[in-house]
Interface confidence: medium
């Protein structure tokens, strides 16, 4: 309409570029049920991982163990909040737990996201050092370095998630009976800049919490695969089975991570781009409606990690079996592994006892014969 033109025949209807947004219809008990399942599997699985790691003697722990433990702690602290989110969703978005738990549980979602991603990146880098550069970087993989790296990643995760702790609040937004747990930008932003804050935080969380770590992980696994492929070309035919399994597990690790988190970050990014590119209404509405399910899938990652990072290790299975055995009959004494040593720690990066190429304390000696033969990713 032109400036100064009469708009008496304008009916007040938004033009077609504005969508017919509607209240999001929750899927009844589906999302709450998934949340509760993730809670049950996540607490059990991650608890088991922590038990397996910490029951081992300190000397037998490897640099990767600290990342494994951190990953389990991150997932565990997050999944314990899932009953709250299950309740919130089931009550059609009515938060009965107060502002403190709204802030805390929201904060833990993002701490978990960052810490998990950083732990996975740490693990990937640890594998890269173990397989691709075992001699040059042996010192980097000492437990002390792992502890420092873990401390840094936790501090970083805690800081990056801080805006959520600050901005999350509860409110009866319309003076109705329902209380929502939501992001309130009013304390840091003017009305006109609220969307900029939302976009800014959204873009930064996707960049720091997905794009950069995933790029690092892919790079690590690319070089790992290259090294393995190069080595196995010189090996006998029976090496092919190991190569396939090793590569397939690596692919499973990366792909699972991507499958769980990609939809969340992709949909979020597409939605934010919509304000610039003006998607068709149907697509915009589709993004809005699918986002809760994408969030749900990303939460599922917190219970999958124990299965992917632990259950691929036969020693972890052995530890689990010994625990179940001990739980039933006390195992007629201390549990022993088939090799005669005490059930060792679960490590996604190293074997547990000194192998043929191991030096003092189980660290690899400076001999690059078969550097990854100690990696527990090679499942016999």
């Amino acid at each position: 309409m032109e400036e100064g033109g009469d708009f008496d025949n304008y009916y007040g209807a938004d033009n077609q570029s504005e969508c017919e947004y509607t209240d999001w219809k929750s899927s009844g008990a589906l999302i709450p049920a998934i949340y509760m399942l993730v809670f049950l599997l996540g607490t059990t699985g991650n608890g088991l991982v922590l038990w397996t790691v910490f029951r081992s003697s300190r000397e037998k722990r490897r640099s990767a163990d600290i990342f494994i433990a951190s990953l389990a702690v991150a997932d565990l602290t997050f999944v314990v909040t899932l009953p709250l989110w299950a309740t919130y969703t089931y009550r059609d978005y009515d938060w009965p737990f107060g502002t403190f738990f709204c802030k805390l549980s929201s904060y833990l979602i993002f701490v978990n996201m960052y810490a998990s991603v950083f732990c996975l990146t740490g693990l990937s880098f640890d594998r890269y050092l173990a397989i691709v550069r075992p001699v040059a970087n042996a010192r980097l993989r000492l437990r002390v370095s792992g502890a420092v790296a873990t401390a840094v990643l936790w501090v970083l995760a805690a800081l990056l998630a801080m805006p959520v702790m600050v901005l999350r609040t509860t409110g009866d937004l319309e003076n109705t009976t329902k209380v929502q747990c939501y992001m309130d930008y009013s304390m840091v932003a003017t009305v006109s800049s609220e969307w900029a804050w939302e976009v800014g935080l959204g873009v930064s969380s996707t960049t720091v919490g997905f794009v950069v770590p995933f790029t690092i992980m892919l790079t690590c696994y690319f070089f790992i695969a290259q090294t393995i492929a190069g080595h196995f070309r010189k090996e006998r035919i029976e090496g092919l089975r190991k190569r396939r399994r090793l590569l397939s597990i690596i692919v499973v690790l990366v792909v699972t991570f991507a499958l769980c988190w990609m939809p969340y970050h992709l949909v979020k990014t597409l939605y934010m781009l919509g304000s610039l590119l003006h998607w068709p209404c149907d697509f915009d509405l589709f993004l809005m409606n699918i986002f809760p399910y994408c969030t749900c899938i990303s939460y599922v990652n917190s219970c999958l990690n124990p299965f992917l990072y632990a259950f691929f290790d036969p020693r972890f299975r052995q530890a689990c079996t010994s625990m179940l055995c001990c739980g039933q009959s006390r195992c007629a004494g201390t549990s022993h592994s088939s090799s005669g040593e005490k059930s060792a720690s679960y490590s996604s990066g190293h074997s547990q006892g000194p192998g043929p190429n191991m030096g003092k304390g189980g660290e690899q000696m400076h001999e690059k014969s078969i550097p990854y033969s100690q990696e527990t990713l090679v499942v016999d």
Partner: antibody, heavy 129, light 107 residues
Framework: EVQLVESGGGLVQPGGSLRLSCAAS????????MSWVRQVPGKGLEWVAN????????YSVDSVKGRFTISRDNAKNSLYLQMNSLRAEDTAVYYC??????????????????????WGQGTTVTVSS | DIQMTQSPSSLSVSVGDRVTITCRAS??????LGWYQQKPGKAPKRLIY???SLQSGVPSRFSGSGSGTEFTLTISGLQPEDFATYYC?????????FGQGTKVEIK
């Protein structure tokens, strides 16, 4: 063309009843909250009541609670206002209006009311003995 | 209930003038305020929602600002068709409440 057409107004005695209807066209009626707003001749506007898309949530001003009932029939693209125990102060032009909300992408369940963007031409209700 | 107080209740202005109408809320309503224009015998029309967002199809000479309890509607360069009554509406909480209106008349 997006349109709302009210009907059912007229003259009624105090204590009497009246049912106002609003026929919607040109948009997906079932996707929107709907409101009734009234205006005493020569006076200001007063919001009366509104109803959620599926009818599961209804809100109204205290002065009409227990007397007026808002309802809808999505199959007929119609909004209704059942007015009982009418009083002289209920005399007004009654407008049917479409509510607009903004929805939080991240926080499902959070909605921001953006007022009424489409209005009908109004129907007059006169309560007099 | 939140009370909305509009000022002035009426004003006489000339075509081309800049008009400012103020609306005060009895308590903080964030940015949950809209502005409506009504001409005699016609239904109201939404001009502004969420304090400053312009309704599509509305000329850009209309603008809104404010936050919390004090809000303003500004018409920069009044046109003949802008002579009408203007209402503010708080859409922060139930019940929704309108201001008493500001009548803009020709001087």
């Amino acid at each position: 063309e997006v349109q709302l057409v009210e009907s059912g107004g007229g003259l009624v005695q105090p204590g009497g009843s009246l049912r106002l209807s609003c026929a919607a066209s040109g948009f997906t009626f079932s996707s929107f909250w709907m409101s009734w707003v009234r205006q005493v001749p020569g006076k200001g506007l007063e919001w009366v009541a509104n109803i959620k898309q599926d009818g599961s949530e209804k809100y109204s001003v205290d002065s009409v609670k227990g007397r007026f009932t808002i309802s809808r029939d999505n199959a007929k693209n119609s909004l209704y206002l059942q007015m009982n125990s009418l009083r002289a102060e209920d005399t007004a032009v009654y407008y049917c209006a479409r509510d607009r909300f903004g929805y939080s992408f991240y926080d499902k369940g959070v909605r921001y009311y953006y007022g009424m963007d489409v209005w009908g031409q109004g129907t007059t209700v006169t309560v007099s003995s | 209930d939140i009370q909305m107080t509009q000022s002035p209740s009426s004003l006489s202005v000339s075509v081309g003038d800049r008009v400012t109408i103020t609306c005060r809320a009895s308590q903080g309503i964030r940015n949950d305020l809209g502005w409506y224009q009504q001409k005699p015998g016609k239904a109201p029309k939404r001009l502004i929602y969420a304090t400053s967002s312009l309704q599509s199809g509305v000329p850009s000479r209309f603008s809104g600002s404010g936050s919390g309890t004090e809000f303003t509607l500004t018409i920069s360069g009044l046109q003949p068709e802008d002579f009408a009554t203007y209402y503010c509406l708080q859409h922060n909480s139930y019940p929704r409440t309108f201001g008493q209106g500001t009548k803009v008349e020709i001087k």
